[in-house]
Amino acid sequence: MMTGTIETTGNISAEKGGSIILQCHLSSTTAQVTQVNWEQQDQLLAICNADLGWHISPSFKDRVAPGPGLGLTLQSLTVNDTGEYFCIYHTYPDGTYTGRIFLEVLESSVAEHGARFQIP
């Protein structure tokens, strides 16, 4: 039985040209996390593997930085980055847990952050 839950930064907004940290956290399970995938809709941004480290998709290599922790920093934001992002935790023996974050990239200087995690 899968008992874990994923907490995320929730719905967040950021300014065009700025950067944002996407973070998830898996809790309430003793399952071992073996890999975390970060995806935007159906597009893979990055993978963090427990044994192999980080792999950044070539199309995002110029504006994605790993961290903090298993999080992902997305830089040089454009309005096209608005949309859903998913953290997919591969665990043993539970299986897969998925968290969702909605990012809105704003033209204006009014941008509110989600407050579940500490985001610089």
Epitope: I21, P68, G69, F117, P120
Partner: antibody, heavy 117, light 107 residues
């Protein structure tokens, strides 16, 4: 097994700059964040910043943003930290450390920097 | 910045005893905390990640616990080789920050 070999001790005059190195082996250099940490008896362990050699992106502690510059040479699997405008407060042991799975899992042996006036 | 406070700078214990080193974060860091051991003259060594998971090769007498803002490293059946400084560190957000350290002394 990951291994980090840091350059030797440095004795440098105040006002000058120094560049120390951290040669990585035993893993894929471009797949892990490399962090730098300062240790002094008074301030303990302080995080300076990190670089992801896969694309060169850096994050700095605001305290060290005008003091330290992090770079990486993927051809030699070596990370570098340059410290500029040295003062006595920069005298410390500096560690490079590779971020593994949710911790700084591998550490170099440290480089001792002594700034003389 | 998130401040990690280790209120006890020194702790004295005897061989075979059980000792708990505590660390308090100034903000919620979930379980994004690691513990390190630094023996005299050596580099730090990672013991615990994600607050409670032991690194491979770390003896099972080392155990981590806690979440949110309060974290504990417990050493059971203390051995002479455990004489060292112990540091907590948060990796919830940049800049990563460390506790001031707790020096474990053997009576």
């Amino acid at each position: 097994q990951a291994y980090l070999q840091q350059s030797g001790a440095e004795l440098v005059r105040s006002g000058a700059s120094v560049k120390m190195s951290c040669k990585a082996s035993g893993y894929t250099f471009t797949s892990y964040n490399m962090h730098w940490v300062k240790q002094t008896p008074g301030q303990g362990l302080e995080w300076i910043g990190k670089i992801f050699p896969g694309n060169g992106f850096t994050d700095y502690n605001q305290r060290f943003r005008d003091k330290a510059t992090l770079t990486a040479d993927t051809s030699s699997s070596t990370a570098y930290m340059q410290i500029s405008n040295l003062t006595s407060e920069d005298s410390a042991v500096y560690f490079c450390t590779r971020e593994g799975w949710l911790s700084l899992g591998y550490w170099g042996q440290g480089t001792t920097l002594t700034v003389s006036s | 910045d998130i401040v990690m406070t280790q209120s006890q700078k020194f702790m004295s214990t005897s061989i075979g005893d059980r000792v708990s080193v505590t660390c308090k974060a100034s903000q919620n860091v979930v379980t994004n905390v690691a513990w390190y051991q630094q023996r005299p003259g050596q580099s730090p060594k990672a013991l615990i990640y994600s607050a409670s998971y032991r690194y491979s090769g770390v003896p099972d007498r080392f155990a981590g616990s806690g979440s949110g803002t309060d974290f504990t490293l417990t050493i059971s059946n203390v051995q002479s080789e455990d004489l060292a400084d112990y540091f907590c560190q948060q990796h919830n957000s940049y800049p990563y920050t460390f506790g001031g350290g707790t020096k474990l002394e053997i009576k």
